[in-house]
Amino acid sequence: SGPLPKPSLQALPSSLVPLEKPVTLRCQGPPGVDLYRLEKLSSSRYQDQAVLFIPAMKRSLAGRYRCSYQNGSLWSLPSDQLELVATGVFAKPSLSAQPGPAVSSGGDVTLQCQTRYGFDQFALYKEGDPAPYKNPERWYRASFPIITVTAAHSGTYRCYSFSSRDPYLWSAPSDPLELVVT
């Protein structure tokens, strides 16, 4: 009959967790599951419960997680991996808009994330997008051109910097930048 369908794994309230702040990992399978297994990859950490409450985020808890469940003698496929990121590990970068934070509809603007440190990766996200509990998109450069701006691009932006050597240890978020489309 094949393996059972994979469960979902989410971090509440977010998979971006400031150091010392709490987060809950929740594995969700179908009703009547006999046993859950939630594990941190590349470690020996695991538990046989669906919910993991982390009362205070630490560097050592950042990383990739997944879960599965058992019904009878059958195990499910593993969930999609969840990347749990510790933020506030490094000083915040600065975020600016070129030529400026006010741009006409149809114009171009570039958001630049800058840091004093030698980080090689940056993450930019817009408040409310992407959906809650989902990692912001990662970009491997410090410039984020937005071509042919529309009203949908207006909003509050923040960026993070981090190193590819420790991809789950991020800086504090930059101060917010309000992009205004006129």
Partner: nanobody
Amino acid sequence: QVQLQESGGGLVQPGGALRLSCAASGFTLDYYAIGWFRQAPGKEREAVSCISSSDGSTYYADSVKGRFTISRDNAKNTVYLQMNSLKPEDTAVYYCATDPFYSDINCKSYEYAYWGQGTQVTVSS
């Protein structure tokens, strides 16, 4: 704020006894395994004893078996390490640690997320 605070260390003569306490604040210890670890000057940190949350099962390093006893009082959110028949080689800084993943015994010290600041135990005549 999640904190572990050790107390009870001090200077004691060989053959003496001490009782170390590890008090938790900011979260409840009920669900977590607790480990006691120690680090002597110039040496690596080593596991001394661990206790599970589920059934109270315990682990002891060979060097302390029969002399040390670990226990927990969930009502007081505290774990204890009773150390009897102390020897000079027990001299070290003693740390307690816990981790949100562990309800069963796990004495791999490098994988504990939460650590206390440590309490000094010196055994000397």
